[in-house]
């Protein structure tokens, strides 16, 4: 499937609109600090060049690889050295090293201001004045803040963003129509970004075998009626799509994703009965719908797994003949029977099964040795079941904010070296598991909770890798992808940690507290809570609760005062002194 001109091939396959959007996303994800106008200029130049190649594939430079073309274009940016420092050194390299270099410099936590949402009328005017620029700006702003966002999915978000403005800017009450839609897009976008970041981490840190195992388990749960060969084909194709997107090959990724959606819709009968609705939709919606499709019903008459994987005398023979295929089939068979298990648990079970076969197939009596292998799964299954049950009970007892606080205390005691903003962000997101998963029926709780926690903990790993401060975090993040969550769960109080010295400035508050949104107030209080635990890591939960209750009362009192700033100045030091005494 070779083409004289790769850029012409992709332009024709994707069409001008998607081509331009994807190139803008690619450039914004690589050069995250460049101004919007600079990126638009680069994209327009690339697009004009692509059009010349479509007209004549033999034209000059049209035979160059996309990495060469895009890399050359990025390296024309005049302020590369001043803005990006050592990233400019990438431009001295040849492909493929140059692209690898750009990838390594992607920043998961770029120093960019939070996006401020203008007034609805201002946004509607901007939308009507120049719709194309308005939507490009959305792609640019999201892509630069989320350098691993799944590019074809970002085009889908942009289409929904456009639809929201098109509808709501005509509405009688624009704000009532638009703001909930924008909130939903923001929250879904953050979740989508985090999920994709885990896929990329899986591929980049643990290799495509790890990703394929994840995909076998997940697709087997979704498509339990599909044959193993069908699931394997989907896994191979999906791995290619995500490898490309994670590697910055966004045009190839989007093209291959469209091909995969086409294949799935043409082969619904051998995949799943749930695909019909998705397949009637236009491309971007269709791909999104297929990715999010609910699990199909399990075939009614699935036999016990024990026959083929425990009782059979041919287990070791079958394993030795093709280890990965045999383990893949085991994972497929187990996963299709267990939509109630998290993917990570299924992968742990497959790992345990593999370890047992490695040991037993070398033993004098292999059958006797592996006869009880399924019994060994019991503790692995019970551990996340218990954890979900207990944390959901705690969530129901405390409510989301106080549950987040419990997690803040828990994680600060485990890894107090981690920066306070990271602990607050990660613990707040860990705490959201309650509202997301605990209301679900029993059979959906574990897959919801544990697979969500894996996504959130990956964010901790990614941030920590940029600025490593804790050997415990490094160990949990790097040793095993599937055991990350159990590794973090098992961490205890860090006895070696030297408590942080008390800094009055950290606990000084002002009247600006009163004008903050409820969420911003919570973040302020939770930041103080983390600092408190770093200062007094052996403080009891009851002591900390008492201090936090006093803090809330003190803020409430001063925000009701006539002279708010004077109240904060007077009551603040009293609160700090009382807190220190309570924790002494």
């Amino acid at each position: 499937d070779t083409h004289k001109s790769e850029v012409a091939h992709r332009f024709k396959d994707l069409g001008e609109e998607h081509f331009k959007g994807l190139v803008l996303v690619a450039f914004s994800q690589y050069l995250q600090q460049c101004p919007f106008e600079e990126h638009v200029k680069l994209v327009n130049e690339v697009t004009e060049f692509a059009k010349t190649c479509v007209a004549d594939e033999s034209a000059e430079n049209c035979d160059k690889s996309l990495h060469t073309l895009f890399g050359d274009k990025l390296c024309t940016v005049a302020t590369l050295r001043e803005t990006y420092g050592e990233m400019a050194d990438c431009c001295a390299k040849q492909e493929p090293e140059r692209n690898e270099c750009f990838l390594q410099h992607k920043d998961d936590n770029p120093n960019l201001p939070p996006l401020v949402r203008p007034e609805v009328d201002v946004m509607c005017t901007a939308f009507h004045d120049n719709e194309a620029t308005f939507l490009k700006k959305y792609l640019y702003e999201v892509a630069r803040r989320h350098p691993y966002f799944y590019a074809p999915e970002l085009l889908f978000f942009a289409a929904r963003y456009k639809a929201a403005f098109a509808e709501c800017c005509q509405a009688a009450d624009k704000a009532a129509c638009l703001l909930p839609k924008l909130d939903e897009l923001r929250d879904e976008g953050k979740a989508s970004s985090a999920k994709q970041r885990l896929k990329c981490a899986s591929l980049q840190k643990f290799g495509d075998r790890a990703f394929k195992a994840w995909a076998v388990a997940r697709l087997s749960q979704k498509f339990p009626k599909a044959e193993f060969a069908e699931v394997s084909k989907l896994v191979t194709d999906l791995t290619k799509v995500h490898t490309e997107c994670c590697h910055g090959d966004l045009l190839e990724c989007a093209d291959d994703r469209a091909d995969l959606a086409k294949y799935m819709c043409e082969n619904q009968d051998s995949i799943s009965s749930k695909l019909k609705e998705c397949c009637d939709k236009p491309l971007l919606e269709k791909s999104h719908c297929l990715a999010e499709v609910e699990n199909d019903e399990m075939p009614a008459d699935l036999p016990s797994l024990a026959a083929d994987y425990v009782e059979s005398k041919d287990v070791c023979k079958n394993y030795a003949e093709a280890k990965d295929v045999f383990l893949g089939m085991f994972l497929y068979e187990y996963a299709r029977r267990h939509p109630d298990y998290s993917v990570m648990l299924l992968l742990r079970l497959a790992k345990a099964y593999e370890a047992t076969l490695e040991k037993c197939c070398a033993a004098a009596d292999p059958h006797e040795c592996y006869a009880k292998v399924f019994d060994e799964f019991q503790p692995l299954v019970e551990e996340p079941q218990n954890l979900v049950k207990q944390n959901c009970e705690l969530f129901e007892q405390l409510g989301e904010y106080k549950f987040q606080n419990a997690l803040l205390v828990r994680y600060t005691k485990k890894v107090p070296q981690v920066s306070t903003p990271t602990l607050v962000e990660v613990s707040r997101n860990l705490g959201k598991v309650g509202a997301k998963c605990c209301k679900l029926p029993e059979a959906k709780r574990m897959p919801c909770a544990e697979d969500y926690l894996s996504v959130v903990l990956n964010r901790l790993c990614v941030l920590h890798e940029k600025t490593p401060v804790s050997e415990k975090v490094t160990k949990c993040c790097t040793e095993s992808l599937v055991n990350r969550r159990p590794c973090f769960s098992a961490l205890e109080l860090d006895e070696a940690y030297v408590p942080k010295a008390f800094n009055a400035e950290t606990f000084t508050f002002h009247a600006d507290m009163c004008t903050l949104s409820e969420k911003e107030k919570q973040v302020k209080k939770q930041t103080a809570l983390v600092e408190l635990v770093k200062h007094k890591p052996k403080a009891t939960k009851e002591q900390l609760k008492g201090v936090m209750d006093n803090f809330a009362a003190f803020v409430e009192k001063c925000c009701k005062a006539d002279d708010k700033e004077a109240c904060f100045a007077e009551e603040g030091p009293k609160f700090v002194a009382a807190s220190q005494a309570a924790l002494a």
């Epitope: 007892q397 205890e492 109080l493």
Partner: nanobody, 123 residues
Framework: QLQLVESGGGLVQAGGSLRLSCVAS????????MGWFRQAPGAEREFAAA???????YYADSVKGRFTISRDNAKNTVFLEMNSLKPEDTGVYYC?????????????????WGQGTQVTVSS
């Protein structure tokens, strides 16, 4: 503040039984989660069993089917019934309390600890 005092430890033959008690003095015992941890010489303190404020029980794999945790809120007491004891069960047994009412297996969830009671299982 909750004070915890364990009792009931001692020397027992392998296969024998013991019943440990932990009395809590302080307020609202019934709202606390209670746990038993044990520490063998030269080893880390490890989880054995726990019971939450509602009465749900959790056990370490190594003691499942042999140990039973229970509580009597009227007497501010938590018990650990230990049967079919093995030499590897030897150690100091500690009672612990969690003010959230949970029954986690991690030490860091528990703020209050007793002084411990020695259990020795001879072969």
């Amino acid at each position: 503040q909750l004070q915890l005092v364990e009792s009931g430890g001692g020397l027992v033959q392998a296969g024998g039984s013991l019943r440990l008690s932990c009395v809590a003095s302080g307020r609202s015992f019934s709202t606390y989660g209670m746990g038993w941890f044990r520490q063998a010489p030269g080893a880390e303190r490890e989880f054995a069993a726990a019971i939450n404020w509602k009465g749900d029980r959790y056990y370490a794999d190594s003691v499942k089917g042999r140990f039973t945790i229970s509580r009597d809120n009227a007497k501010n007491t938590v018990f650990l019934e230990m049967n079919s004891l093995k030499p590897e069960d030897t150690g100091v047994y500690y009672c612990a309390a969690d003010s959230d009412g949970s029954a986690f297996s991690r030490r860091l969830e528990y703020d209050y600890w007793g002084q411990g009671t020695q259990v020795t299982v001879s072969s």
